[in-house]
């Protein structure tokens, strides 16, 4: 973010805020970057009763406020000025703050509190399971007790639909009300990327509020699923953790569940999907089981629902295989065994080579003997051949 000077606003109360012959004045320092700013009152001559609050970062810009409490009666002879300095932008601002005359009637300025509207996607499991009904949900919060009822309108790809179920508004702990409307949708409409719009209207709103949602755009990528047995260090405890690692999937909508011998397991927790550097996501799921259940050889299955998968589903099972577990003590013992094994292999190779050499020597000796015998035989026969050639007509 680039260097941005602050805007400074004086904060003066109405007479209703003036109590015990004291008045609190304030200064709002808004929209600056980077930190810090310094706030003084009357160039530092006012220091008691000063509170400067920590800065808050919002949308890459900082905002802070400072207040000073001064006597209101008799009126201070001097005006109260807040002095703001922002070194990074070489900005200095002085704002005079004039407390209102205590005799005036309180000025009541009521800014209409507009309710907030939020739209939520369907649960991934509902979208991918035929016997469940996916629903898009629209929630209106901060409705005042005196506000009239809100009306919901729903649109699928800008075509109005009338199948939503709107619940009666519910009172919240802070005495505001909340209103919820749910639109049951077709599985394929969500998967095909249709847009769902919720329009909320009320006499209390200056204008209707609209919120739109659809499936994350982009090519679905199937997750890789790996199961990880409990670490050996955990085997000293009564409970052990089985882990399911689900990686490289897109979009982030995913359901991860566990089964134990074919029945749903309850005692598991999933992380929220976390984005990889390449834009895909990964999730970990941890199932806690009694060590005795693990050691008994029960089968635990990590079940994953994601639109990128064939059948939108895959699962990986995990069970305790004592013969295949190799812990460090065993590995250390194995190191010793490997030393012995190398000795055995060396002796075996030496003996093998010796036997090959011996066989080769014997074979060569025999071949040489046979060869010399044949040569001798040939020499005794050749003269006779010559004689016969010579006798030819």
């Amino acid at each position: 973010a680039k260097t941005t000077p602050p805007s400074v606003y004086p904060l003066a109360p109405g007479s209703a805020a003036q109590t015990n012959s004291m008045v609190t004045l304030g200064c709002l320092v808004k929209g600056y970057f980077p930190e810090p700013v310094t706030v003084t009152w009357n160039s530092g001559s006012l220091s008691s009763g000063v509170h400067t609050f920590p800065a808050v970062l919002q949308s890459d810009l900082y905002t802070l406020s400072s207040s000073v409490t001064v006597p209101s009666s008799p009126r201070p002879s001097e005006t109260v000025t807040c002095n703001v300095a922002h070194p990074a932008s070489s900005t200095k601002v002085d704002k005079k703050i004039v407390p209102r005359d205590c005799g005036c009637k309180p000025c009541i300025c009521t800014v209409p509190e507009v309710s907030s509207v939020f739209i939520f996607p369907p649960k991934p499991k509902d979208v991918l399971t035929i016997t469940l009904t996916p629903k898009v949900t629209c929630v209106v919060v901060d409705i005042s007790k005196d506000d009239p009822e809100v009306q919901f309108s729903w649109f699928v790809d800008d075509v109005e639909v009338h199948t939503a179920q709107t619940q009666p508004r519910e009172e919240q702990f802070n005495s505001t009300f909340r209103s919820v409307s749910e639109l049951p949708i077709m599985h394929q409409d969500w998967l095909n990327g249709k847009e769902f719009k919720c329009r909320v209207n009320s006499a209390a709103f200056p204008a209707p509020i609209e919120k739109t949602i659809s499936k994350t755009k982009g090519r679905p990528k199937a997750p890789q699923v790996y199961t990880i047995p409990p670490p050996k260090e955990q085997m000293a405890k009564d409970k052990v953790s089985l882990t399911c690692m689900i990686t490289d999937f897109f979009p982030e909508d995913i359901t991860v569940e566990w089964q134990w011998n074919g029945q749903p397991a309850e005692n598991y927790k999933n992380t929220q999907p976390i984005m990889n550097t390449n834009g895909s996501y990964f999730v970990y799921s941890k199932l806690n089981v009694q060590k005795s259940n693990w050691e008994a050889g029960n089968t635990f299955t990590c079940s994953v629902l994601h639109e990128g998968l064939h059948n939108h589903h895959t699962e990986k099972s995990l069970s305790h295989s004592p013969g295949l577990q190799l812990d460090e003590t065993c590995a250390e013992a194995q190191d010793g065994e490997l030393d012995g094994l190398w000795t055995t292999i060396t002796i075996f190779i030496s003996l093998f080579l010796l036997s090959v050499c011996y066989s080769a020597a014997v074979t060569l000796f025999k071949v040489k003997w046979i060869f010399s015998s044949v040569v001798e035989l040939k020499q005794t026969l050749v003269p006779e051949y010559k004689n016969m050639i010579g006798q030819a007509p």
Partner: nanobody, 124 residues
Framework: QVQLVESGGGLVQPGGSLTLSCATS????????IGWFRQAPGKEREGVSC????????NYVDSVKGRFTISRDNAKNTVYLQMNSLKPEDTGVYYC?????????????????WGKGTLVTVSS
């Protein structure tokens, strides 16, 4: 060749019962979850019920819970949908679909095989 053939549909009065069958051939039913779907006139196809490959897990859409029962007989390579207390809104073409896996889910996509459907009409 792989086939799923639905049968048992017909005209029935409201409150009546029907049993649909999904006969499979060309593959071993033991390894497949089976889902029943229906499509009402002018509407999209929707899931009705699901049974896992072992038969150990069954699921129903809310609108048919307590009225429909899904079951399977792997020896006969057949899956059944017993439909009681039928309502006019149950009218439609009923399809079965097969998913190759042992999970307890019938999902909204990725079916391996589909049948051609059987018509159920609930009317007085």
């Amino acid at each position: 060749q792989v086939q799923l053939v639905e049968s048992g549909g017909g005209l029935v009065q409201p409150g009546g019962s029907l049993t649909l069958s999904c006969a499979t051939s060309g593959f071993s039913l033991d390894y497949y979850s089976i889902g029943w779907f229906r499509q009402a006139p002018g509407k999209e196809r929707e899931g009705v019920s699901c049974i896992s490959s072992t038969g150990g897990s069954t699921n129903y859409v809310d609108s048919v819970k307590g009225r429909f029962t899904i079951s399977r007989d792997n020896a006969k390579n057949t899956v059944y949908l017993q439909m009681n207390s039928l309502k006019p809104e149950d009218t439609g073409v009923y399809y079965c679909a097969a998913y190759r896996r042992s999970g307890a889910y019938c999902t909204s996509g990725g079916q391996d095989y589909w049948g051609k459907g059987t018509l159920v009409t609930v009317s007085s």
